[in-house]
């Protein structure tokens, strides 16, 4: 196997590799630095393995996976060193590296010249006490949202930031505004920002307006 790659968004984590097998199968093992290797996706002909269940046990740990190749019908086959042939993945630390999924604007509410914009707190596959944690639960204040907003009638964008899931911004009375948000983890060195949310504009069904 080669080109082992971690594909991870909001902690949903898949290991992908090449090539498509012809006459052999794959088994994946994953471990933290403890070296307690756990086998997954036994003798599969797929070239991906969902490792979410393993990495969500502790998203701050660093993981390594390895893909073993076995000739079909002979799961005991070994390389010249007397062991199954395998290749190691790059290291992967979910908390530092999982991609931030595209956020969604849950609602916005205008009261006079103020608008409260709320970002949906997406549920992740990380569990604590048998309940799934939200993105905010996992990242806490490490996660911020950036709001981009502009008058429907112009293209000049303004920005606001929050380390909660809510923004309170000033707007001009009588003007319609459009909004888009982006999730950001400023402390990261990679995968710092999500893609922008879909644009939501005042006058559409997500909004509430009160004088």
């Amino acid at each position: 196997a080669f080109n082992l790659t971690w594909i991870s968004t909001d902690f949903k984590t898949i290991l992908e590799w090449q090539p498509k097998p012809t006459n052999y199968t794959y088994t994946v093992q994953i471990s933290t630095k403890s070296g307690d290797w756990k086998s997954k996706c036994f003798y599969t002909t797929d070239t991906e393995c969902d490792l979410t269940d393993e990495i969500v046990k502790d998203v701050k740990q660093t993981y390594l996976a390895r893909v073993f190749s076995y000739p079909a019908g002979n799961v005991e086959s070994t390389g010249s060193a007397g062991e199954p042939l395998y290749e190691n993945s790059p290291e992967f630390t979910p908390y530092l590296e999982t991609n931030l999924g595209q956020p969604t604007i849950q609602s916005f509410e205008q009261v006079g010249t103020k608008v409260n914009v709320t970002v949906e707190d997406e549920r992740t596959l990380v569990r604590r006490n048998n309940t799934f944690l939200s993105l905010r639960d996992v990242f806490g204040k490490d996660l911020i949202y950036t709001l981009y907003y502009w008058k429907s009638s112009s293209s000049g964008k303004k920005t606001a930031k929050t380390n909660t899931n809510e923004f309170l911004i000033d707007v001009d009375k009588g003007e319609n505004y459009c909004f888009s948000v982006q999730a950001v983890i400023p402390s990261r060195t990679v995968n710092r920002k999500s893609t922008d949310s879909p644009v939501e504009c005042m006058g559409q069904e997500k909004g509430e307006f009160r004088e």
């Epitope: 933290t32 630095k33 070296g35 290797w37 060193a81 190691n88």
Partner: antibody, heavy 118, light 106 residues
Framework: EVQLLESGGGLVQPGGSLRLSCAAS????????MGWVRQAPGKGLEWVST????????YYADSVKGRFTISRDNSKNTLYLQMNSLRAEDTAVYYC???????????WGKGTTVTVSS | DIQMTQSPSTLSASVGDRVTITCRAS??????LAWYQQKPGKAPKLLIY???SLESGVPSRFSGSGSGTEFTLTISSLQPDDFATYYC????????FGGGTKVEIK
């Protein structure tokens, strides 16, 4: 500061036994595989054994298989190497090392000397 | 077992020299190689892992390269503190060390 401190070395007769200990501090002991590496006088490094963080997986060099047993007590942050049926060629400085994934050694102890001689 | 062969076994050099040590594996080990430095009477110290990743706190004059069966450790400008013995170690299949390269003062 991450520290490893070996003890238990000494002079032992051929066929005898010895138990080495390695006290770890400065890191979460159970989060890491650990290993033993030895160095005979004037020679190079030789890997001896590795154990996973839970103690569930162990690996041995062919030269010590069946004679040496690696173990750990995570509640005491201590790694052990039980050495039985010792031979003259087991004479060496034995180093304990922290071994991420059981692959390479990123922190080493100062070593303890084992001499097998009659 | 995978055999690791280092060359040269001894290398004479002067402060400021660029020094290169080679390590060959008896079969492909991809990039699963580490380099260590050891001074007399002391424990080894990790310099490089995964063939080219510099361990935290190690001076940038040390670098590693290579993949497959041939690897090099380079010291860009030899310092007085660098006179020591250097070992490579593969971790593709269990663990084996090279025989060591002693870097001595010319």
């Amino acid at each position: 500061e991450v520290q490893l401190l070996e003890s238990g070395g000494g002079l032992v007769q051929p066929g005898g036994s010895l138990r080495l200990s390695c006290a770890a501090s400065g890191f979460t002991f159970s989060d890491y595989a650990m290993g033993w590496v030895r160095q005979a006088p004037g020679k190079g490094l030789e890997w001896v054994s590795t154990i996973s963080g839970s103690g569930g997986l162990t690996y041995y060099a062919d030269s010590v298989k069946g004679r040496f047993t690696i173990s750990r007590d995570n509640s005491k942050n201590t790694l052990y190497l039980q050495m039985n049926s010792l031979r003259a060629e087991d004479t060496a400085v034995y180093y304990c090392a922290k071994a991420p994934y059981g692959y390479y050694m990123d922190v080493w102890g100062k070593g303890t000397t084992v001499t097998v001689s009659s | 077992d995978i055999q690791m062969t280092q060359s040269p076994s001894t290398l004479s050099a002067s402060v400021g020299d660029r020094v290169t040590i080679t390590c060959r594996a008896s079969q492909s080990i991809s990039s699963w190689l580490a380099w260590y430095q050891q001074k007399p009477g002391k424990a080894p110290k990790l310099l490089i892992y995964k063939a080219s990743s510099l361990e935290s706190g190690v001076p940038s004059r040390f670098s590693g390269s290579g993949s497959g069966t041939e690897f090099t450790l380079t010291i860009s400008s030899l310092q007085p503190d660098d006179f020591a013995t250097y070992y490579c170690q593969q971790y593709k299949s269990y663990i084996t060390f090279g025989g060591g390269t002693k870097v001595e003062i010319k």
